[in-house]
Amino acid sequence: GSTVPPMVNVTRSEASEGNITVTCRASGFYPWNITLSWRQDGVSLSHDTQQWGDVLPDGNGTYQTWVATRICQGEEQRFTCYMEHSGNHSTHPVPSGNSHHHHHHHH
């Protein structure tokens, strides 16, 4: 099939006092091979500080996956989610509050 770019969505949730979990989700993409990773101040986080979901079919002939990491509350602006897929790339910031979600579709 032809390339379908992902929709990228960054969310945040309370983890423990003073910490939040930030999750970067990519969905609706084809083919399956996608890079999704967190950066702090532009530097890649080590593998052992990130958690990945498997790349799974979403039932529409496309795929979905996610990556999450735990960060200190108040330091959200230092973190970005990086995505590479089929020759395209993008970076996505952490939303400033619980009610904000960032959705980006990339072509």
């Epitope: 091979n33 890079t35 999704l36 990773s37 080590s46 593998h47 052992d48 590479e84 395209n88 790339h89």
Partner: antibody, heavy 120, light 107 residues
Framework: QVQLKESGPGLVAPSQSLSITCTVS????????VNWVRQPPGKGLEWLGM???????DYNSALKSRLSISKDNSKSQIFLKMNSLQTDDTARYYC??????????????WGAGTTVTVSS | DIQMTQTTSSLSASLGDRVTISCSAS??????LNWYQQKPDGTVKLLIY???SLHSGVPSRFSGSGSGTDYSLTISNLEPEDIATYYC?????????FGGGTKVEIK
């Protein structure tokens, strides 16, 4: 097919700088990371750093002050620059494509390497 | 940095033998381990990624296993073209680090 080829000066004088070019084919630099790895004679492999599809770089902190990695997407070339070379920088320098898929991160295709000797 | 140790720097085996190469990490690396083969001419190839996944085009006689800090590469039926040095590499923490290598020779 995916290929990477390194080209370098061969010989560099101590305290001088090193510039190596990695020319790639079969894939786009805008959507792939490329790594630099070196191997001193008779020794093991050492990761130097990498450049991502968006041009962002990660470096081995032990060498970060002397290293610079850049690229030219239109020419399909990646550049390694290293300053203040000493004799223990004598090594074979490789570029390698990175595959970064969730829990699976690896260097799936390597160049043949270019030998750099630091000597006066 | 995480130290990777391959205690056997070289070994001799007969054609058809089962050969096992060991690698240990200075701390747990959660299966974030790859194996590479370097031929005498310096050519490097990926064999195994994420502890046990066989890279495409690699013969099925190669297999990987392990967990925690201890990992191994097995060649089930040694062939002449397997004469090479084998390196393990962790990517749990940055920078990625390699073991010192195990050279496999024919008896």
């Amino acid at each position: 097919q995916v290929q990477l080829k390194e080209s370098g000066p061969g010989l560099v004088a101590p305290s001088q700088s090193l510039s190596i070019t990695c020319t790639v084919s079969g894939f786009s630099l805008t959507g792939s990371g490329v790594n630099w790895v070196r191997q001193p004679p008779g020794k093991g492999l050492e990761w130097l750093g990498m450049i991502w599809g968006d041009g962002n770089t990660d470096y081995n902190s032990a060498l970060k002050s002397r290293l610079s990695i850049s690229k030219d997407n239109s020419k399909s070339q990646i550049f390694l620059k290293m300053n203040s070379l000493q004799t223990d920088d004598t090594a074979r320098y490789y570029c390698a494509r990175g595959a970064y898929y969730g829990k699976r991160w690896y260097f799936d295709v390597w160049g043949a390497g270019t030998t750099v000797t630091v000597s006066s | 940095d995480i130290q990777m140790t391959q205690t056997t720097s070289s070994l001799s085996a007969s054609l058809g033998d089962r050969v096992t190469i060991s690698c240990s990490a200075s701390q747990g690396i959660s299966n974030y381990l790859n194996w590479y083969q370097q031929k005498p001419d310096g050519t490097v190839k990926l064999l195994i990624y994420y502890t046990s996944s066989l890279h495409s085009g690699v013969p099925s006689r190669f297999s990987g296993s392990g967990s925690g800090t201890d990992y191994s590469l097995t060649i089930s039926n040694l062939e002449p073209e397997d004469i090479a040095t084998y390196y393990c590499q962790q990517y749990s923490k940055l920078p990625p680090t390699f073991g010192g290598g195990t050279k496999v020779e024919i008896k």
